[in-house]
Interface confidence: low
């Protein structure tokens, strides 16, 4: 039977819900899938189920709720129906389903190189997703940076931070690294998708050193 797969709000102002459509794989003809929702006024459900306002904008098998239909303080229940029967139901508050878009504009600068020339420290910077209203404090994002050598499979995770830059220490010179960052709404929701990978190549010692050092 069709099931909700994910509800997500990228910026606490809109949200969308997606579901699987396995009608064609099963033997049972379920008929068209419809999504209905209800919102709660303070302690009470309105008891009025309304149909999805927009089946198109978030893609196939989805319902999109624009800012007119979204309130972070009011809990929602949604249900999928087919032939008049409920096939799946889910309740949540918008704050619970916040998953920000990936951070953007990742770049790095060299901080320093160890005396031995074997290790280097870098500063990684990025920007919050464009649709996250950081300035007015509507969203407070925390970020998690991960990095690894290109040929490794396991990512090293850094502790979550609230700033949009972080130093990464003791990287090996002559190695290429991959760096990625993801974010979440502080105190609620889940981490969003990772940013595009930033490649960091640390050149050899001789390229960091001034000629004067050899005299």
């Amino acid at each position: 039977e069709p099931k909700f797969t994910k509800c997500r709000s990228p910026e606490r102002e809109t949200f969308s819900c997606h579901w699987t459509d396995e009608v064609h794989h099963g033997t049972k003809n379920l008929g068209p899938i419809q999504l209905f929702y209800t919102r709660r006024n303070t302690q009470e459900w309105t008891q009025e189920w309304k149909e999805c306002p927009d089946y198109v904008s978030a893609g196939e098998n989805s319902c999109y709720f624009n800012s007119s239909f979204t309130s972070i303080w009011i809990p929602y229940c949604i249900k999928l129906t087919s032939n008049g029967g409920t096939v799946d139901e889910k309740c949540f508050s918008v704050d619970e389903i916040v998953q920000p878009d990936p951070p953007i504009a990742l770049n790095w600068t060299l901080l320093n190189v160890s005396l031995t020339g074997i290790h280097a420290d870098i500063q990684v910077r990025w920007e919050a997703p464009r649709n996250a209203d950081i300035q007015k404090g509507w969203m407070v994002l925390e970020y998690e940076l991960q990095y690894k050598e290109v040929n490794e499979t396991k990512w090293k995770m850094m502790d979550p931070i609230l700033t949009t830059s972080v130093p990464v220490y003791s990287l090996k010179v002559d190695k290429e690294y991959e760096v990625r960052v993801r974010s979440k709404q502080r105190n609620s929701g889940n981490y969003g998708e990772f940013s595009e990978v930033l490649y960091v190549t640390l050149p050899q010692m001789s390229q960091f050193t001034c000629e004067e050092d050899f005299y």
């Epitope: 709660r40 303070t42 302690q43 009470e44 809990p75 508050s93």
Partner: antibody
């Protein structure tokens, strides 16, 4: 300071009536959700009824539906519980409590309770 | 109606003990769960709201957590004034429902 003071409890015969009052101070009843919650001797807590003057909404537990009426006089900042056709099983301490939904908090809960008033239904 | 199944119904503990009380909701109630403390002859007092938020003025030894439909109240180090009855409550659906209560007694 937020305060809720119940009054109107007492001894009443089965089938009789009582009207409980809940005088509020320190906040506006209009922008609140006022609940009546009862506790039978030695038992747990049971929600009885609620009113939201702002939404114009009232709600009742099945056990009291049709017998109890909740109301509010916002000019007096007071809520009431009119109890008719009282039964022995309605014997309990009745608390009024508030849920203040303009507090801005996510799912802020019932945060203030009155001291309670005892209703005894007995012949 | 949503059932809130609270356990244990009573427990004996000593001052300094770590105490855990659990509540299971019969279906999803999001994070709309509160915990109250009640002493004999007194009104309940709010300890935790929104499953894990500590109400103002409540000592930090009290904490709440949520895992799906399971909710937990933890007292990290029981104090003499903590001997009381504790109730969980869901306020996601109407009617609001309470757990049966857990009486914490002195061992």
């Amino acid at each position: 300071e937020v305060q809720l003071v119940e009054s109107g409890g007492g001894l009443v015969q089965p089938g009789g009536s009582l009207r409980l009052s809940c005088a509020a101070s320190g906040f506006n009843v209009y922008y609140s959700y006022i609940h009546w919650v009862r506790q039978a001797p030695g038992k747990g807590l049971e929600w009885v009824a609620s009113i939201s003057p702002y939404y114009g909404y009232t709600s009742y537990a099945d056990s009291v539906k049709g017998r109890f009426t909740i109301s509010a006089d916002t000019s007096k900042n007071t809520a009431y519980l009119q109890m008719n056709s009282l039964r022995a099983e309605d014997t309990a301490v009745y608390y009024c409590a508030r849920y203040y939904y303009w507090s801005g908090g996510r799912f802020s809960a019932i945060d203030y309770w009155g001291q309670g008033t005892l209703v005894t239904v007995s012949s | 109606d949503i059932q809130m199944t609270q356990s244990p119904s009573s427990l004996s503990a000593s001052v300094g003990d770590r105490v855990t009380i659990t509540c299971r909701a019969s279906q999803s109630v999001s994070s709309a769960v509160a915990w109250y403390q009640q002493k004999p002859g007194k009104a309940p007092k709010l300890l935790i709201y929104s499953a894990s938020s500590l109400y103002s003025g409540v000592p930090s030894r009290f904490s709440g957590s949520r895992s799906g439909t399971d909710f937990t109240l933890t007292i990290s180090s029981l104090q003499p004034e903590d001997f009381a009855t504790y109730y969980c409550q869901q306020y996601w659906f109407s009617p609001i429902t309470f757990g049966q209560g857990t009486k914490v007694e002195i061992k």
